[in-house]
Interface confidence: medium
């Protein structure tokens, strides 16, 4: 008599997450009498997947009617596949008894599940940095299978090369995660710049997933300061201007000091944006020269985005201003810091 064969024709089956998987199994003989059971994995820790006689297997259905006479097809269909269903499935023939005795197993069919990566999430540095400094951006995507995946970084459309990428775990798994770090050198023009993390995977039909981050959230552009004096007015008042230019973000406080004493404090708000995304702000201070005996030292002090204050000083020479109307001013700029250095 010919020995019973349990035939699983497919070595492997690959399906997309959410689809159904058909696992084929036929037997070569109806003898001996006894049930067929499906297991995932082999050995003592194997998991029962389907048993016609007993149990509740809501996602598993037989492909053909196993109750009909002379049925030799014990193929099953598993619906709504998830990555957790990956593994090797065995069709096993038992001899009827008390208890039933395992007689023969099929060679096994490896089910691999193709799962899409999650939308890449890009995170930037916790604190802002200034131009010429390097900041790191991280991109993460999870839950994909198979392991092969491509991740690229772009800044304003140009691919970045200072990148380190890891796919975990290193060994075999039902699904994988990717984490990549890109290092970007900031420039003063980067307020409107964007970094993109692009993930390509076979499940995406050639349409990569993208995650983005705006460099505006990572950059601080410190201001340039310039203090100038306008011509003296007829009423012996000098108009001194503090121009604060090319700064980002907008958060800025300006304080005028006259001979070291606070004269006025202003907060920048609702400023128009320059083309490059930075801001400018101009503040005026009127100094009544006739009220001073000595030269007046004016200081424009700017605190930008919580950073240490930057000062720009200017001396108005009272001695150079006779008390008659309409005379011209002579002023000396004694300031040094034209911009903040970090």
């Amino acid at each position: 008599e010919e020995e019973l064969q349990v035939i699983q024709p497919e070595k492997s089956v690959s399906v997309a997450a959410g689809d159904s998987a058909t696992l084929n199994c036929t037997v070569s003989s109806l003898i001996p009498v006894g049930p067929i059971q499906w297991f995932r994995g082999a050995g003592p820790g194997r998991e029962l997947i389907y048993n016609l006689k007993e149990g509740h297997f809501p996602r598993v259905t037989p492909v053909s009617d196993p109750t009909k006479r002379n049925n030799m097809d014990f193929s099953i269909r598993i619906s709504n596949i998830t990555p957790a269903d990956a593994g090797t499935y065995y069709c096993v023939k038992f001899r009827k008894g008390s208890p039933d005795v395992e007689l023969k197993s099929g060679a096994g069919t490896e089910l691999s599940v193709r799962a899409k990566p999650s939308a890449p999430v890009v995170s930037g540095p916790a604190v802002r940095a200034t131009a010429e400094h390097t900041v790191s951006f991280t991109c993460e995507s999870h839950g994909f299978s198979p392991r092969d995946i491509t991740l690229k970084w772009f800044k304003n459309g140009n691919e970045l090369s200072d990148v380190q990428t890891n796919v975990d775990p290193a060994g075999k798994s039902v699904s994988y995660s990717i984490r990549s770090t890109a290092r970007v050198v900031l420039t003063r023009r980067d307020v409107h710049s964007q970094v993109i993390c692009e993930v390509a995977h076979v499940t995406l039909q050639g349409d990569p997933l993208r995650g983005t981050a705006n460099l505006s959230e990572a950059i601080r552009v410190p201001p340039f300061l310039e203090v100038t004096q306008q011509s003296m007015r007829a009423d012996n008042q000098v108009n001194v201007t503090c121009q604060v230019t090319k700064f980002y973000p907008q958060r800025l406080q300006l304080t005028w000091l006259e001979n070291g004493n606070v004269s006025r404090t202003e907060m920048a708000s609702a400023l128009p944006e320059n083309k490059d995304g930075t801001y400018n702000w101009t503040s005026w201070l009127l100094v009544n020269v006739s009220a001073h005996r000595d030269d007046v030292k004016l200081t424009c002090q700017v605190e930008h985005d919580g950073q240490p204050a930057v000062n720009k000083s200017f001396s108005v020479k009272v001695s150079a201003h006779p008390k008659e109307q309409g005379s011209n001013t002579a002023a000396e700029n004694t300031g040094t810091n034209e911009r903040n250095i970090y």
Partner: antibody, heavy 118, light 109 residues
């Protein structure tokens, strides 16, 4: 049943243009990347172009130097290949093929013959 | 551009196992090349057999299987049938383009 039916082939003079169509049925075109592959008389297969499922991304053979453009109308379940500046060496049977995922040519059309000759 | 090389012709007998291979000029074929195997029968009838190295297209007989053997992609027909006589093309993916091999003419005598 999945079916791919190419049309638009024919005889064209060197330097001329031709537009091939591939009508897809039995599946939703937008869910699949699609490709054009050609076979010159007595030769093997040469890959021409791929369009991603949405049509937003395309990949083309460098050898074609931008003369061919792949596109699709997912609402009409149709893939296209616009061929410009045709040369004698473009004479071939052009096949459209469906990609299961992005790495798996599963179904092929019956082909459309393009002959470039004066 | 990479060159993909296949045996030009192979002959087997019904019931025998035959293996066709596919070599890349750039080095070892890996899973990232997503090896495909396509069958051409007379009258330009093409059928995708294997994709992504080892995934068999639904409806393709179980005797066809794909794998990597050494540094090459391989198509194995276990128990060849007379109807398997055809030309078999492999295709490999290189980052942004596919390259087909020249094809293997399989004769089943």
């Amino acid at each position: 049943e999945v079916q791919l039916l190419e049309s638009g082939g024919g005889l064209v003079q060197p330097g001329g243009s031709l537009r091939l169509s591939c009508a897809a049925s039995g599946f939703t075109l937008s869910s699949y990347a699609m490709s054009w592959v050609r076979q010159a008389p007595g030769k093997g297969l040469e890959w021409v172009s791929i369009s991603s499922g949405s049509g937003a991304n395309t990949y083309n053979a460098d050898s074609l130097k931008g003369r061919f453009t792949i596109s699709r109308d997912n609402s009409k379940n149709t893939l296209f290949l616009q061929m410009n500046s045709l040369r004698a060496e473009d004479t071939a049977v052009y096949y459209c093929a469906r990609l299961r995922f992005f790495d798996w040519f599963d179904y092929w059309g019956q082909g459309a013959l393009v002959t470039v000759s004066s | 551009q990479a060159v993909v090389t296949q045996e030009s012709a192979l002959t087997t007998s019904p019931g025998e196992t035959v293996t066709l291979t596919c070599r890349s000029s750039t080095g070892a074929v890996t899973t990232s090349n997503y090896a495909n195997w396509v069958q051409e029968k007379p009258d330009h009838l093409f059928t995708g057999l294997i994709g992504g190295t080892n995934n068999r297209t639904p409806g393709v007989p179980a005797r066809f299987s794909g794998s990597l053997i050494g540094d090459k992609a391989a198509l194995t027909i276990t128990g060849a049938q007379t109807e398997d006589e055809a030309i078999y093309f492999c295709a490999l993916w290189y980052s942004n383009h596919w390259v087909f091999g020249g094809g293997t003419k399989l004769t089943v005598l």
